[in-house]
């Protein structure tokens, strides 16, 4: 009685099951009444990743440096190649096939979390007490300079985008 | 469908050479292998050698170094080059499908002075 | 070499009645995908060999089911259970298991 299923890492054709290729190898010959499954080995720059039954091996994804591509870890046969971008650049999608500028935060917010190969800057509006004056893709908001602690005076109220202006306590008082 | 026909059998003298095609229909070689079979007149069945659908060759111990066998996708055909032939290579040789029941219809080969 | 041993070499069977042939081997026949390649061909008078039975107890299409196939490791089994006039040829066992591939001697069954 020809099997209708096949146990794990076996593939059914023909009604026989026949063993699936190992990863980092394609499928030549089916297995047949003599002969066990015929795979070969993927060729440079080829793989697959996982136990199959393909006549071609994928290629290597290739990291384009027109793109701001640059290779995190070299493809082996079982493995393709994965990209990042370069510094200053994060992908665009998960499978990041292209790099943008890493975003600055605009005077008024502050870096949340600093960008990576693969994820943009997070800005974060500065709360009150805090600030940011510049537009930058690394500089947090600071908080408002303490005048209490220099023995100074607030003379000038602090805002989301400047500090605090700090002067003498007033001596007539 | 699958068709296997030889090709190429005759009377050699011993020490000649020879070449058998096996050319195919109905299946590709780069997917599909074959062997070569011979039967003595009067015999058994032996073995002589397959091509793989990868492209890579076994043979029997008997032949080994002797004869050879290749392949041409383009052409579909598998060709024994035989050499240094011997009387008792007398035999009809079959080209076989390695799976099903294929084979061709036989090619008689006559080593003799 | 590995080395298959048929036997008998000559088999007269009444018509009707089972026939047996043995198939033994040098070396185990179970290949380390736990396939076991042992082959049965029957060559009738004048014909090329015709595939029965393959992987020791699969019958290939079309061939009847008087021929049946048992076995394992070293030791196989050909019975066909009532012999009819067209089963009259030399029977083969052969395996490819190991490189490189082998036949039996044959055995030759004729009608009493």
């Known amino acids: 009685e020809p099997p209708t299923a096949c146990r794990e890492k076996q593939y059914l054709i023909n009604s026989q099951c026949c063993s699936l290729c190992q990863p980092g190898q394609k499928l030549v010959s089916d297995c047949t009444e003599f002969t066990e499954t015929e795979c070969l080995p993927c060729g440079e720059s080829e793989f697959l990743d996982t136990w199959n039954r393909e006549t071609h091996c994928h290629q290597h994804k290739y990291c384009d440096p027109n793109l701001g591509l640059r290779v995190q870890q070299k493809g082996t046969s079982e493995t393709d190649t994965i990209c990042t971008c370069e510094e200053g650049w994060h992908c665009t999608s998960e499978a990041c096939e292209s790099c943008v500028l890493h975003r600055s935060c605009s005077p008024g917010f502050g870096v949340k979390q600093i960008a990576t190969g693969v994820s943009d800057t997070i800005c974060e509006p500065c709360p009150v007490g805090f600030f940011s004056n510049v537009s930058s893709a690394f500089e947090k908001c600071h908080p408002w300079t303490s005048c209490e602690t220099k023995d100074l005076v607030v003379q000038q109220a602090g805002t989301n985008k400047t500090d605090v202006v700090c002067g003498p306590q007033d001596r007539l008082r | 469908q699958v068709q296997l026909v030889e090709s190429g059998g005759g009377l050699v003298k011993p020490g000649g050479s020879l070449r058998l095609s096996c050319a195919v229909s109905?299946?590709?070689?780069?997917?599909?292998?074959v062997y070569w079979i011979r039967q003595a007149p009067g015999k058994g069945l032996e073995w002589m050698g397959m091509m793989w659908g990868g492209g890579s060759t076994d043979y029997s111990t008997s032949v080994k170094g002797r004869f050879t066998i290749s392949k041409d996708n383009a052409k579909t055909s598998v060709y024994l080059q035989m050499s240094s032939l011997r009387a008792e290579d007398t035999a009809v040789y079959y080209c076989v499908r390695t799976d099903g029941d294929y084979w061709g219809q036989g090619t008689l080969v006559t080593v003799s002075s | 070499e590995l080395q298959l041993t048929q036997s008998p070499l000559s088999l007269p069977v009444t018509l009707g009645q089972p026939a047996s042939i043995s198939c033994r081997s040098s070396q185990s026949l179970a290949s380390s995908s736990g396939n076991t390649y042992l082959h049965w061909y029957l060559q009738r008078p004048g014909q090329s060999p015709r595939l029965l039975i393959y992987?020791?107890?699969n019958r290939f299409s079309g061939v009847p089911d008087r021929f049946s196939g048992s076995g394992s490791g070293t030791d196989f089994t050909l019975k066909i259970s009532r012999v009819e006039a067209e089963d009259v040829g030399v029977y083969y066992c052969s395996q490819s298991t190991h490189v490189p591939w082998t036949f039996g001697g044959g055995t030759k069954l004729e009608i009493k």
């Open positions: 992987k020791v107890s």
């Open positions: 109905g299946f590709s070689l780069s997917r599909y292998s």
